[in-house]
């Protein structure tokens, strides 16, 4: 019977007839930076080329006995998970292994850097098809390792890494914390985060998605036909490297940004029990378990978006937090969130020729997060239109006035410490959907975009009595690009997008003594691209 | 040539003490630095260290991804190394682990 992990990543409609994609990643080369491996194991023979690269520290302890099968254990298993004949994800993918971890599974940042440099030089000497680099290792936060990963990613290489097995914030580890790397946490057969002894999978905003990482059957270096079950975020990362190889084999021209968006899009949503994560990390941790796309043909017609959380701003009065999109993504909206509710909103601003999302802390606040909605929108031309505080009772308004520009997101930012309870009209005047409405004491920022065939609409959900959470979702075929709250009063903790749902959080009603005057509305902006849909239909 | 005015190179090390590997450092040079300049900077560090009575060993010169070099040296030389031309930052080596 098919192992649970392979079943889990296989699209449901293919499970019955043991779905086997046509080429299984055959156009892709996967580099593995790990321990030595038993490359002639039956499960991977002929699939893995062992390079002559080796950069490992000496083993610890004077009495360490170097036993070949132990030295090869970790790497052999992962090679099997990626491309094994019977228990592999991308059965057609070819692999190259670099030894950067010793027989105790230990390496150095410098050895890993030299390994990444080796890959870059190999790529320049002999350019092949798409490259995936699997880094099933973790160390403490390293500026230089993250920088090297960024450079390699910008050279068109897809890097996939383990989130780490420390039951901790993945942002404290490298290469897990590198934004350009696809960082993978581990879940089990029950779709729960994996516990590993007293520790477990890492979590937090630096994790892109989760994948099977407990009791994973794969090649064992104990003998040439042996299998063994191993657990960890390395195994989870190996699944995603395999899925990435499959996707790139089907669509070799995919960029890193497109691949990441597809991995997120095709993941199983909201299946992880978030109670396992520390409370302050739940909102930041993606509730996504990786899966193969239902068809090896692209989903080019779709407008793909993802949510990117910033680091925490810190509690000082003027503290700000910045969330950035990847180089080939468009920032379509910006929102903010503070657990204390003390924030001064957010704004989209240009930085180095690119829009970023900046959130502002308020006096007495414990800090804020900026939340960027980052989308793939080819040939887009986006700009931000700002209206200063109106001071008028009707509130501040701003709209997209340029011909052909549509509203993709609304942000509001205020200088005053407390906006007070002003209630602007929730519904926009008819015929003016391209308009942001906000508090009279706030500056309002509209993200206005022009792109072929882009159409957007505003969807609102208001609850008359105060609620801790109000949500509104975009319907099938539409993608959430903007998420904001009305009104922007102080009891609103903030707004953020989770998949295709806009979530507005308010302070606990019982502690705020709020009145029904302070009803909260979640405002979603839902978009779709007729241009992408047409292009896709023409291809078929 | 002195480091560019107003830019101070910074030193970084692993926050997890047991994972630190003092004595080996990655010297990262500014983005557009050529291989020949990296090699010159490394030699300059060795020469200046030798004048102070310190032995250093250049383990690897980086190019292709990041300009810089890997050096085995005493931590006493960090202040000197941070003042070298083209230096962006220096990071102490540290351990990584199979996950």
């Amino acid at each position: 019977s098919i192992p649970w992990n392979l079943e889990r990543i296989t699209p449901p409609r293919y499970r019955a007839d043991e779905y086997q994609p046509p080429d299984g990643g055959s156009l892709v080369e996967v580099y593995l930076l790990d321990t030595s491996i038993q490359s002639d194991h039956r499960e991977i023979e002929g699939r893995v080329m062992v390079t002559d690269f080796e950069n490992v520290p000496e083993e610890d302890g004077t009495r360490f006995h170097r036993q070949a099968s132990k030295c090869d254990s970790h790497g052999t298993h992962l090679a099997g998970v990626v491309s094994g004949r019977d228990a592999g994800v991308a059965k057609g993918a070819s692999m190259r292994s670099l030894r950067v971890l010793n027989c105790q599974g230990k390496g150095t940042v410098s050895g890993t850097l030299i390994g990444l440099e080796f890959i870059r030089k190999s790529q320049l000497v002999q350019p092949v098809g798409p490259l995936v680099v699997l880094l099933p290792l973790a160390g403490g936060y390293s500026r230089v390792l993250n920088a090297a990963c960024q450079r390699l990613a910008r050279a068109g290489v897809v890097l996939v890494t383990a989130a780490g097995n420390f039951r901790d914030d993945a942002c404290l580890y490298s290469p897990a914390s590198a934004p350009e790397v696809i960082t993978v946490g581990a879940t089990n057969a029950q779709d729960q985060p994996v516990t590993l002894g007293t520790l477990g999978t890492n979590f937090g905003r630096c994790v892109d998605l989760f994948a099977p990482g407990e009791d994973i059957i794969g090649a064992s270096s104990d003998c040439s036909t042996c299998f063994v079950s191993q657990s960890g975020t390395s195994q989870a990362a190996a699944h995603v490297a395999g899925i990435a190889a499959m996707m790139l084999s089907a669509e070799p021209e995919l960029t890193l940004a497109e691949l990441r968006q597809r991995l997120i899009h095709f993941s199983a949503k909201d299946v992880i029990n978030e109670a396992w994560f520390p409370e302050d990390q739940r909102v930041l941790t993606p509730n996504l378990v990786a899966a193969l796309p239902p068809s090896t043909h692209g989903a080019g017609w779709q407008l793909f978006c993802r949510t990117v959380w910033s680091a925490h701003s810190g509690p000082t009065r003027m503290a700000t937090a910045i969330a950035r999109c990847a180089p080939d993504e468009e920032l379509l909206s910006c929102s903010s969130f503070s657990r204390s509710g003390k924030r001064r909103g957010e704004r989209m601003e240009a930085q180095g020729g690119k829009l970023v999302c900046r959130a502002h802390n308020a006096f007495g606040g414990e800090g804020v997060y900026a939340i960027a909605r980052c989308c793939l929108l080819p040939q887009a031309n986006c700009s931000v239109h700002t209206a200063p505080p109106a001071e008028a009772s009707m509130g501040t308004r701003v709209h997209c006035h340029q011909q052909g520009h549509v509203l993709t997101g609304c942000s509001s930012h205020w200088e005053v410490e407390d906006l007070g309870t002003h209630k602007p009209p929730v519904l926009r005047p008819r015929g003016q959907p391209n308009q942001c409405v906000g508090h009279r004491e706030a500056s309002i920022h509209a993200s206005c975009c022009h792109a072929p065939g882009l159409e957007c609409k505003v969807k609102e959900h208001g609850i008359p009595a105060p609620q801790e959470q109000v949500t509104v979702a975009c319907e099938e075929g539409w993608t959430l690009t903007g998420c904001s709250a009305l009104p922007g009063t102080s009891h609103v903790l903030g707004a953020y997008a989770v998949d295709n749902t806009c979530v507005v959080r308010s302070r606990d009603v019982s502690t705020t003594g709020s009145t029904s005057e302070e009803a909260v509305t979640a405002v979603a902006i839902c978009c779709r691209s007729r241009h992408l849909a047409q292009a896709s239909q023409e291809l078929q | 040539e002195a480091p560019e005015h107003g830019t101070t190179a910074t030193f970084h090390r692993c926050a997890k003490d047991p994972w630190r590997l003092p004595g080996t450092y990655v010297v990262v040079l500014k983005e557009e630095t050529h291989l020949s300049q990296s090699e010159r900077t490394a030699r300059r560090l060795q020469a200046q260290a030798a004048r102070r009575g310190y032995l250093t060993k250049i383990l690897h010169v980086f190019h292709g991804l990041l300009p810089g070099f890997l050096v085995k040296m005493s931590g006493d030389l960090l202040e000197l190394a941070l003042k070298l031309p083209h230096v962006d930052y220096i990071e102490e080596d540290s351990s990584v682990f199979a996950q």
């Epitope: 023979e45 004949r85 040439s224 036909t225 | -």
Partner: antibody, heavy 115, light 109 residues
């Protein structure tokens, strides 16, 4: 190109031993082991076992019952199969093939056991 | 390990299609993606025709195709040609070893 070249034919007496060699070329040796397969006259193919160029590990078919030894010498890119206590029913063509996948085969070595 | 079961012989006329079956158990054919098919002409070494159930090595005619259902694998040869006359063997992984079928003699009439 990928090639496996085997040693020449052997005629042995019952109870003797035979050692057949197989020299590999044209590929990365450590990525594949060597399988040994035999075929008695007019019969089908029988898998005898496998040996690693990477670490010398072996995997023998149960039927060999300790009579066979498979080894490799990476320095000469050569694999060996030794069969001891030969019996007349060991008369066969012995093939080496690349890996478990057996995608490339040697030309075969005829071993005749006759008194 | 007992051999996989193949028909002793099959025959077909030029241009026809024939199928050779190979039946095992869930411990071999049914349990692995690694079923291979070999062609052997008299006095020659076997030649790999199909690997991993349905993949063709480069240089092998697309008239040869493989499939598997449950514990039975099949080799289909379409557009039969005189040079296809040979013995055909299937092969599968088992948990620790490899097992061949007894062989099928294909006669092109």
């Amino acid at each position: 190109q990928v090639q496996l070249v085997q040693s020449g034919a052997e005629v042995k007496k019952p109870g003797a031993s035979v050692k057949v060699s197989c020299k590999a070329s044209g590929y990365t040796l450590t990525s594949y082991g060597i399988s040994w397969v035999r075929q008695a006259p007019g019969q089908g193919l029988e898998w005898m076992g496998w040996v690693s160029f990477y670490n010398g590990n072996t995997n023998y078919a149960q039927k060999l019952q300790g009579r066979g030894t498979m080894t490799t010498d990476p320095s000469t890119s050569t694999a060996y199969m030794e069969l001891r206590s030969l019996r007349s029913d060991d008369t066969a063509v012995y093939y080496c093939a690349r890996g478990y996948g057996m995608d490339v085969w040697g030309q075969g070595t005829t071993v005749t056991v006759s008194s | 390990q007992s051999a996989l079961t193949q028909p002793a012989s099959v025959s077909g006329s030029p241009g026809q299609s024939i199928t050779i079956s190979c039946t095992g158990t869930s411990s071999d054919v049914g349990g692995y993606n690694s079923v291979s098919w070999y062609q052997q002409h008299p006095g020659k070494a076997p030649k790999l025709m199909i690997y991993e159930v349905s993949n063709r090595p480069s240089g092998v005619s697309n008239r040869f195709s493989g499939s598997k259902s449950g514990n039975t694998a099949s080799l289909t040869i379409s557009g039969l040609q005189a040079e296809d006359e040979a013995d055909y063997y299937c092969n599968s992984y088992t948990s620790t070893s490899m097992v061949f079928g007894g062989g099928t003699k294909l006669t092109v009439l």
